[in-house]
Structures are given as C-alpha cells and as structure tokens.
C-alpha cells in the first residue's frame, strides 16, 4: 500500500471576504492523478463534487466551485478532500467565507477574475480561448 | 455503466455542416469536462475540444485546426455532449470520438465523418 | 503547443517479452501524461493516466514512469491480446497532443 495522500489546500479568489451579490471561486488543489475533489461545509452535512480537474503546475492539480452571487448563508467554514486512485485524502485546513460588505469606494465594484484562468494564466487553459460565457457559473442555491 | 453513444456523422460536401451528438450514461454527466478527439482514416489521434463544467462557466477549448468552425457544447439536463462542425473541409474526415475527461477515461464507439464532393 | 514524440513507430515482439515505448514532450509536464491502447476498428482505451497511475481493470503487467520530459510505457510480460496500436497524450495544457502512436506486432 502506498504512503499517505498529500494533504489539499484550499484558497478563495478574488479573496476570503466577499461583499454580497459578488462571485467567489473556492480552489482546492492537490496532486496530479486526482479523480474528484469535494468541497465541504463545516459540518460535512453539504459537500459538492467534481471531476472537473485541470492543472494548476506540473506537480498539482485543482478544482474550482464557483459561486456566481454570494449570501450571508454561503458564509462559513470551508475545506476540501480528495479522491485519488479509489482513496480519500485528509482534509484540508478550513477556509473562512465572510460575506460582508467591503468598505472603501463603492463606485468600484470588486473585480471578477477569469474563472478559468484566475489571477495567474495556467497552462491547461492556454488555448487563448474566446468562449468561455462571461457567467454561467454555480449559483449559490445549487452548490449548498 | 458508463456509456457514450455518439451520433450525427455522415457523408457531406466541403463547406457543408453536420453537428454530432453524443448521449451520456452510467455517470454524473454534469461534474465532467467532455471532450471530442477524431482519427483520420489509418492515422493517429488528434484532440479536436473540450468543455469544461458549469463550475467553470462552461470554458471551452478548441484544436487550432478547428477553431471558428467547430462548436463545442453540452446540455446537462439532457446528459448531452454536442460538436457542431460548419465549414467542413475534406481534412476533417474522421472518426470521432466523444471522451469523458480529464483523464480520457471513457470514450465512446466513435461516429464516422466523411467531407468528400 | 506541446509536442509528443513517441518512439520507436513500430516494433515485433513475441508473446512473453518485456516491451518498452517511449514519448519525450518538447517542454515539461509534470506527470500530466496518458498512455492509450487501440486495436483495430475500436476506440481507444486509457491504460495509464498521471504517467504511473494504472486505470481501472488494466493487467498489472502494464506500467508506466517517468516525469518532466521523458515517460516509459512498459509491458513486462506480452501477451496476445497485447498487440495493438499504443499512445502517448499530454494532458498539461490544450491542445492535448497524442504522439504518433507505436504499432505492436507480432513476430
């Protein structure tokens, strides 16, 4: 039997703290060969799942869970886990939604990254791709 | 089971249009990127596009062979894999096939396109 | 784009040999690599995904290693129904190449 999985890691863009009615994309990212990734609630009571994994370097792999328009009930404790060669990994560490208003100019909404290329281009989605709709993503009411 | 059935090819002349279907089955159609790979006649693979899922705002991707001609697609409700093929070209004769990805775990029968005048 | 040369492009072997192919990326990718195996008249099957990790109901005598540029598929012990047509596929970033396929004879 193999050694233990990698542990995943977690991470939101544009950020952790989110004014409502903006999108948020939580990442889990984890080794290369992932089958699925889950993103859960604290209580592990929800949890959604992908099989849509790109890479993220050589070595990782990621999935990414897109809410289009955040709530005060997608605020909470997030963490991903993995399926690897018909093994789960650990979890990962929580992340912590906050869904508030930012303050600061609001004459500047905060800005939407490419959800599939996020802040940095990578080379999964190198194809200079022009059809991705501008968003289509997971609405908040299906992903929990 | 997972099953990928593919249908639409046929026989069409150049500059001509066809759209290819391809009927998902066995899994959760909706959590994967899809996509389409094509076979000439007595040569190698070559990946054609991909659509990746709801979460990823349907992102897609194309061969530079094909891009502006051919349209990826998918109708989740109906477990649905879609390549709409336009300005077909006699190089375009292939099998093709629909594939579930990422890890081209799945491929279907394959649906012969023939672009000859 | 990407790159995958796969050699050598046909090879005769017997049944019981240990049989070796090789793809070479022309930039890194990680373990971002697929070996395929198709017979004729039928669609191709994945053998090998993440450059070693073995995919669901293929025989233990397949294997594959390596990572970065260089990746090796091998096949400790072949059997008949062996030969076939084998692929390379880097899955690092689109367009997904495929090399250009190693035929398997029989000698």
């Known amino acids: 039997q193999e050694g233990p999985l990698p542990r995943p890691s977690i991470s939101a863009e544009p950020g952790t703290v989110i004014p409502p009615g903006r999108p948020v994309t939580i990442v889990c990212r984890g080794p290369v060969g992932v089958d699925q990734f889950r993103l859960e609630r604290e209580d592990r009571s929800k949890f959604n799942d992908t099989k849509d994994v790109s890479q993220a370097s050589p070595s990782e792999s990621e999935a990414r869970f897109r809410i289009d328009s955040v709530s005060e009930g997608n605020a909470g404790h997030y963490r991903c886990l993995y399926v690897k060669s018909t093994r789960w990994s650990e979890h990962s560490d929580y992340l912590d939604l906050v869904v508030k208003e930012t303050s600061g100019d609001t004459d500047s909404p905060v800005t939407e990254p490419d959800s599939s290329a996020g802040p940095t281009q990578r080379p999964s989605d190198n194809s200079h791709n022009e059809h991705a709709p501008a968003s289509q993503g997971l609405s908040a009411e299906h992903l929990y | 089971e997972v099953q990928l059935v593919e249908s639409g090819g046929g026989l069409v002349k150049p500059g001509g249009s066809l759209r290819l279907s391809c009927a998902a089955s066995?899994?959760?159609?909706?959590?994967?990127?899809m996509n389409w790979v094509r076979q000439a006649p007595g040569k190698g693979l070559e990946w054609v596009a991909r659509?990746?899922?709801?979460?990823?705002?349907?992102?897609?991707y194309y061969a530079d062979s094909v891009k502006d001609r051919f349209t990826i697609s998918r109708d989740d409700s109906k477990n649905t894999l879609y390549l709409q093929m336009n300005s077909l070209k006699t190089e375009d004769t292939a099998v093709y096939y629909c594939v579930r990805g990422p890890y081209f775990d799945y491929w279907g029968q394959g649906t012969l396109v023939t672009v000859s005048s | 784009d990407i790159q995958m040369t796969q050699s050598p492009s046909s090879l005769s072997a017997s049944v019981g040999d240990r049989v070796t192919i090789t793809c070479l990326a022309s930039q890194t990718i990680g373990t971002w690599l697929a070996w395929y195996q198709q017979k004729p008249g039928k669609a191709p099957k994945l053998l090998i995904y993440?450059?070693?990790s073995l995919a669901d109901g293929v025989p233990s005598r397949f294997s594959g290693s390596g990572s970065g540029t260089d990746f090796t598929l091998t096949i400790s012990s072949l059997q008949p129904e062996d030969f076939a047509t084998y692929y390379c596929?880097?899955?690092?970033?689109?367009?997904?190449?495929f090399g250009g396929g190693t035929k398997v004879e029989i000698k």
């Open positions: 596929q880097q899955l690092y970033s689109t367009p997904y190449t």
């Open positions: 066995g899994f959760t159609f909706n959590i994967n990127a």
């Open positions: 993440a450059a070693t």
């Open positions: 659509i990746r899922t709801k979460n990823n705002n349907f992102a897609t």
